[in-house]
Interface confidence: medium
């Protein structure tokens, strides 16, 4: 069937559009064309006959068709008129006639589209704004976008005139956005440039910065004012009442009780014409005094007196805060704290309480420290100590001996010669002493505060002969491969050389043995029971020499793993048991047995007389040395068989 | 014009001694205590000793207990701070800082501060 | 000895803009913690004592609050010049110990 089709069926206006014809019929005279629905000879574009290949124009021919062979015409610069139907009249060589019709629209290319509003500047919650898209185009549909997002659902936004005016009733600060509208047609989209809405809203209530309202006096008062609004506020101050400033921002400096008062910021809006105002009460305080710290005993004296620190001045609503020694307070049960923690009492001082001790205060006002208060404890004297420690001293060298003992305040000192007072020094000096500066040497050390006395005796030897030595040590009786021992040469003499022998021989040579303190001690690391020798020291000036008595170093070890004897392990019936154990030990260990892991005695001998297969079983010995804590024990499998079953079995003791 | 002035940084081996000066002026110097605080390359702030107006309270940190020494000359308006067996973690800014009028234990006042490097 | 934690460790923010930093402390040290503000190459520079109190000539825009083991300093419409490292200290017992620092810098 013959049929028209339009390429394409929306034309724009100034485009071309082709009228195609589909299925034409073979052996054809010619065809025309014709605007409208009907072959009418008034409304003929052109004609055309094949065998001449001759194109007729008619009355609507407007010079912008061309006809092609196929039937198919095209229309150039297409205008508005152009719209509609197209018919095409076949004539074929039998004389018979064939029609078709077909149509194509023809819209505007749209212009780009604008967006008028009836309200520049609306007011938040009183004012609506109508948008309207223009120009006014038939034919077109109309869309509208907000922030580039198609409009959303509200009760508050409207459209109307075909889509082309948006209404937005009782506009709020949150409708300040970019509007856009754009109109379609089959042919063409366009978009305007965005319109921002400018709601007028405010002022809302002001806010007033910081929050804080207590203030201390000689602080900066440094208040800020804001408040939402379009355009922005105009700010005023009134403090009471009073007009103060038009600003945002109100500073005080130095501020004094007297600044205390009712501070108003009010906000204006000069477009919406509104007022609001917030109020803040400012309370300033005066500077409250710089903590310090009280003491009800200035001078206490150690392990006698407490003493109570109280942290000045009393407040209400304060917490009170201690240190000691840049530290919070240990816990002590000497140290107690009042009930509102102003008062700390330290009970029987001691030298270590000195401090610095340091109290604060804490409250919404203010924040304090003290100065540091240190403690003045008297204590001592402590018994004095005399230096050198040398006892012997040869004729003709001077003697001079020192003391001192702790003590708060420092210790007055005095020396006593076998009971006479000599003179009120810390230091003693006698030149060129002879045997008659023998005798006892008598430091008195005396604290005027506490009227407390201590003295040191120490006896002095001067003879050209020097003393027999002893030998003193610090552990009598050391543990193998644990302790350590120091022999120290006694007594300690001013120009003598210290030897040692052991066993009668020199010392050998051995990181375990080690002189020090001028030779006058000798100490032995981890000590071992060949340690336990015969240890002799000796001294010497250039006019004498003498020895120690031997000391015998007692080491205690052990005990070792010990030893079953006899070794046998088999055993006939109706033989005696003999067992006996042995262990190296220092003191002798304590034994005890165990058979097949039940007690037995506490002995070093265990006898069983007329033993039997019944007897068979694990024997152990078990080892205990009390000096040393330790412990050994060994175990023996003893097998008794019944009477001549077995060759070269022990018949017992 | 309140102002600390530190000197006597430079490069000291490790194991050696070192000697910073402070000179205080445009306060009283005898009536407020006096800090050292360093700052090591690209660290945060670290504490290192304080001196109390007469000498009687001294405090130092762990890290330099028993090596560094501070001491004061008050007619003199200067803080000292003796740092011996210097080790490469002391490479640091040394300032001097001044504890507030009022007791508290914060610095409000630091010198420019003076360079310290160890390193052999 | 009481530890301090400073967070964020870095910070970019732009002129205008409103910004706070925080800082945690180990156990209660009260109101006893300072701010200071180090420019690069400078000496640090006391800003806040006592948590809140702002020290002698520092510009309103900052404040400090807290207590207890809380605390963090607000600095609102950043000018040019507060770009650059801030450290928060306590001033309660020894050894007064720093944190980290937060490094403010321009967006």
């Known amino acids: 069937k013959l049929t028209i089709e339009s390429t394409p069926f929306n034309v724009a206006e100034g485009k071309e559009v082709l009228l195609l014809v589909h299925n034409l019929p073979q052996h054809l005279f010619g065809y025309s064309w014709y605007k409208g629905e009907r072959v009418d000879g008034n409304r003929q574009i052109i004609g055309y006959v094949i065998g001449t290949q001759q194109a007729t124009p008619g009355p609507a021919y407007s010079g912008r068709e061309i006809i092609y062979p196929n039937a198919s015409l095209l229309i150039q610069n297409i205008i508005q008129n152009d719209t509609g139907f197209y018919t095409l009249h076949v004539i074929k060589s039998d004389l018979v006639n064939e029609e078709a019709t077909g149509q194509f629209r023809v819209y505007p290319e749209l212009p780009k589209p604008s967006i008028s509003s009836n309200n520049s500047k609306p007011v938040e919650d009183k004012d609506a704004v109508a948008f309207t898209c223009e120009p006014e185009t038939q034919d077109a549909t109309y869309l509208w976008w907000v922030n580039n997002q198609s409009l959303p659902v509200s009760p508050r936004l409207q459209l109307s005139n075909g889509n082309r005016t948006l209404t937005l009733f009782n506009v709020t600060r949150n409708d300040t956005a970019s509007y856009k509208c754009e109109t379609q047609n089959p042919v063409s989209a366009r978009r305007s440039d965005s319109v921002i809405l400018n709601v007028l809203y405010g002022p809302d209530a002001p806010t007033i910065s910081p929050l804080n309202t207590s203030y201390r006096s000689g602080e900066n008062l440094n208040l800020s004012c804001h408040a939402a609004s379009n355009p922005p506020a105009q700010y005023s101050w009134f403090v009471n009442g009073t007009f103060q400033q038009s600003t945002q921002e109100l500073f005080i400096p130095n501020i004094t009780v007297n600044n205390s008062g009712s501070y108003t910021c009010q906000a204006h809006n000069s477009d919406t014409g509104l007022n609001r105002t917030t109020v803040t009460t400012i309370t300033v305080y005066a500077e409250p005094p710089k903590p310090f710290i009280t003491s009800n005993n200035s001078n206490p004296v150690e392990d006698e007196d407490a003493v109570a620190l109280t942290c000045e001045p009393e407040i209400q609503n304060t917490t009170y805060l201690w240190w000691v020694n840049n530290q919070s307070l240990p816990v002590s049960p000497r140290l107690q704290l009042s009930n509102d923690n102003r008062t700390l009492t330290l009970l029987s001082v001691t030298r270590n309480d000195v401090g610095p001790y340091e109290c604060g205060i804490q409250n919404e006002l203010s924040v304090d420290h003290s100065d540091p208060v240190i403690l003045n404890v008297l204590y001592g004297p402590d018994d004095p100590t005399i230096s050198p420690s040398y006892t012997y001293y040869r004729p003709g060298v001077n003697l001079s001996l020192s003391c001192h003992a702790a003590s708060n305040p420092p210790a007055q000192y005095s020396w006593l010669i076998d009971g006479n007072i000599q003179q009120h020094t810390q230091e003693l000096f006698i030149s060129n002493i002879t045997e008659k500066n023998s005798g006892l040497y008598t430091c008195q050390a005396n604290n005027s505060a506490s009227g407390h006395s201590r003295t040191t005796v120490k006896t002095i030897t001067v003879s050209a002969e020097l003393p027999k030595p002893s030998i003193s040590s610090n552990n009598s009786k050391p543990v193998e491969d644990k302790d350590a021992v120091a022999f120290t040469c006694e007594p300690e003499a001013q120009n003598t050389t210290y030897l040692w022998w052991v066993n009668g021989q020199s010392l050998p040579v051995s990181p375990r043995l080690q002189l020090s303190n001028g030779n006058r001690t000798l100490t032995l690391f981890n000590v071992t029971r060949n340690d336990a020798r015969a240890y002799v020291c000796g001294i010497q000036n250039s006019v004498s020499a003498n020895r120690s008595d031997p000391v015998t170093l007692d080491v205690l070890y052990g005990p070792d793993t010990p030893i079953i004897s006899p070794p046998d392990s088999s055993y006939l019936s109706g033989a005696n048991l003999n067992l006996s154990c042995h262990s190296a030990s220092n003191p002798s260990p304590q034994y005890s047995w165990r058979i097949n892991g039940i007690p037995q005695q506490h002995t070093q001998v265990l006898f069983i007389a007329k033993i039997t297969p019944n007897n068979n079983g694990t024997y152990a010995c078990f080892v205990s040395n009390l000096a040393t804590g330790r412990n050994n024990s060994i175990v023996k499998s003893i097998t008794v068989s019944a009477s001549g079953t077995s060759p070269g079995l022990s018949a017992g003791a | 014009d309140v102002q600390l002035v530190e000197s006597g940084g430079g490069l000291v081996q490790p194991g050696g001694s070192r000697e910073l000066s402070c000179a205080a002026s445009?306060?009283?110097?005898?009536?407020?205590?006096m800090h050292w605080v360093r700052q090591a390359p690209e660290r945060g702030l670290e504490w290192v000793a304080y001196i109390s107006i007469g000498s009687d309270i001294i405090y130092y940190a762990d890290t330099v207990k028993g090596r560094f020494t501070i001491s004061r000359d008050n007619p003199k308006n200067t803080l000292f701070l003796q740092m011996t067996s210097l080790r490469s973690e002391d490479t640091a800014v040394y300032y001097c800082?001044?504890?507030?009028?009022?007791?508290?234990?914060?610095?409000?006042?630091w010198g420019a501060g003076t360079t310290v490097t160890v390193s052999s | 000895d009481i530890q301090m934690t400073q967070s964020p460790a870095s910070l970019s923010a732009s002129v205008g803009e409103t910004v706070t930093i925080t800082c945690r402390t180990s156990?209660?040290?009260?109101?006893?913690l300072a701010w200071y503000q180090q420019k690069q190459g400078k000496s640090p520079h006391l800003l806040v004592y006592n948590a809140k109190t702002l020290a002698e000539g520092v510009p309103s825009r900052f404040s400090g609050s807290g207590s207890g083991t809380q605390f963090s300093l607000k600095i609102i419409s950043l000018q040019p010049e507060d770009f650059g490292t801030y450290y928060c200290?306590?001033?309660?017992?020894?050894?007064?110990?720093f944190g980290g620092g937060t490094k403010l810098e321009i967006k």
């Open positions: 800082t001044r504890r507030s009028y009022r007791s508290y234990w914060y610095f409000d006042v």
């Open positions: 445009g306060f009283t110097f005898s009536s407020f205590g």
């Open positions: 200290q306590h001033h309660f017992l020894s050894p007064w110990m």
């Open positions: 156990e209660n040290i009260y109101s006893y």
